[in-house]
Amino acid sequence: MKVLQEPTCVSDYMSISTCEWKMGGPTNCSAELRLLYQLVFQSSETHTCVPENNGGVGCVCHLLMDDVVSMDNYTLDLWAGQQLLWKGSFKPSEHVKPRAPGNLTVHTNVSDTVLLTWSNPYPPDNYLYNDLTYAVNIWNENDLADSRIHNVTYLKPTLRIPASTLKSGISYRARVRAWAQHYNTTWSEWSPSTKWYNSYREPFEQR
């Protein structure tokens, strides 16, 4: 049994780090492999992650952490029974992928404005809470070329756009993702998308 692509891990900087790797051939990850992880700190336990399959040769493991601070470092050992396949380490603060924003809602009750709101995925006591900026993707369901990204660089998880900038009588979808500038993170996954119908009509059309 051989590791083809060594484990790479990303942390949500809260309670979960996700490690992925590829094996040299088809593998039943949960039956054949174990990823052991231990915080490098006095009296910390060695925990065992049972991986799950991620495609034919891919495996994924979720490492559980109570909290994350910048100096945390974990040792990682990938085992197949009594055989050590790979040994490495992982510093969560250097490989951050934020959680996806949630509760994306579209408010169209103000006649000439579309208001999008969403929730910050972190609690106020988390370091990332005040460091997130967002990208909102809006697209026309019937015309994928009619798609735009709005960068939200302020802290408040809201975006206002003039309804007039969208085509009238068309269904649109929106989704949002986040990143944290000071932690040099990757982008989060996109939030689930939400759909609305743009019923706005310009004044001259209504005459």
């Epitope: 915080l39 336990e45 109570d66």
Partner: antibody
């Protein structure tokens, strides 16, 4: 210094209740773990009672014999309790608090599997 | 799950090689730990995951096995090793942590 300190032990009458406490100190706040209770009757072996996850999930596991009469709860990630009800003479023992490692599959299935560090124990005597 | 530990007691001399076995009633992979306990004291972790030495434990202690059969070996018994030893088996399929009955090691 890394340590676990139990308290709340003492003498109680049969049918009575007692709540034991365990306070942890000296650990990294980052380290996910279970907090568990194990007991040892005089001159007998060790017996696992149950565990509670110290993180936000707070999931609990119990030995089959302990379900119902024994309840493990937590005030925080560093303070846990063992509530014991309807006590019997055979519950007389030294009760130990212990930190445990775990096995996890995904983020919702987490099972405690070895006790890495133990407190000094607190004595419980059930007698009339 | 049941953990059958043997022998229940043994007498040995300083310098002896001592072996204690533990048998699980079902496959527990490598989820087995060994503990040492001295009178009036809390148990101390020696070995986890069947063969991994806990921090600060002397290298004369070693563990082996997987599945259902496990062994704790003390390669050269020292005066401070006279104590009671317990195995702990963990079955995540049945959701239980069970200690063996213990092995008391005394001076011959």
């Amino acid at each position: 210094e890394v340590q676990l300190v139990e308290s709340g032990g003492g003498r109680v009458q049969p049918g009575g209740s007692l709540r034991l406490s365990c306070a942890a100190s000296g650990f990294s706040s980052s380290s996910a773990h279970y907090m568990c209770w194990v007991r040892q009757a005089p001159g007998k072996g060790l017996e696992w009672i149950g565990c509670i996850y110290a993180g936000s999930r707070g999931s609990t596991y119990y030995a089959s014999w302990a379900k119902g009469r024994f309840t493990i709860s937590k005030a925080s990630s560093t303070t846990v309790y063992l509530q014991m009800n309807s006590l019997r003479a055979e519950d007389t023992a030294t009760y130990y608090c212990a930190r445990a490692a775990f096995v996890n599959r995904g983020v919702s299935w987490i099972w405690p599997y070895y006790f890495s560090l133990w407190g000094q124990g607190t004595q419980v005597t059930v007698s009339s | 799950i049941q953990m059958t530990q043997s022998p229940s007691s043994l007498s040995a001399s300083v310098g002896d090689r001592v072996t204690i076995t533990c048998q699980a009633s079902e496959d527990i992979e490598s989820y087995l730990a060994w503990y040492q306990q001295k009178p009036g004291k809390a148990p101390k972790l020696l070995i986890y995951r069947a063969s991994t030495l806990a921090y600060g434990v002397p290298s004369r202690f070693s563990g082996s096995g997987s599945g259902t059969d496990f062994t704790l070996t003390i390669s050269s018994l020292q005066p401070e090793d006279f104590a009671t030893y317990y195995c702990l088996g963990s079955s995540y399929s049945t959701g239980s942590n069970i200690f063996g009955t213990g092995t008391k090691v005394t001076v011959l």
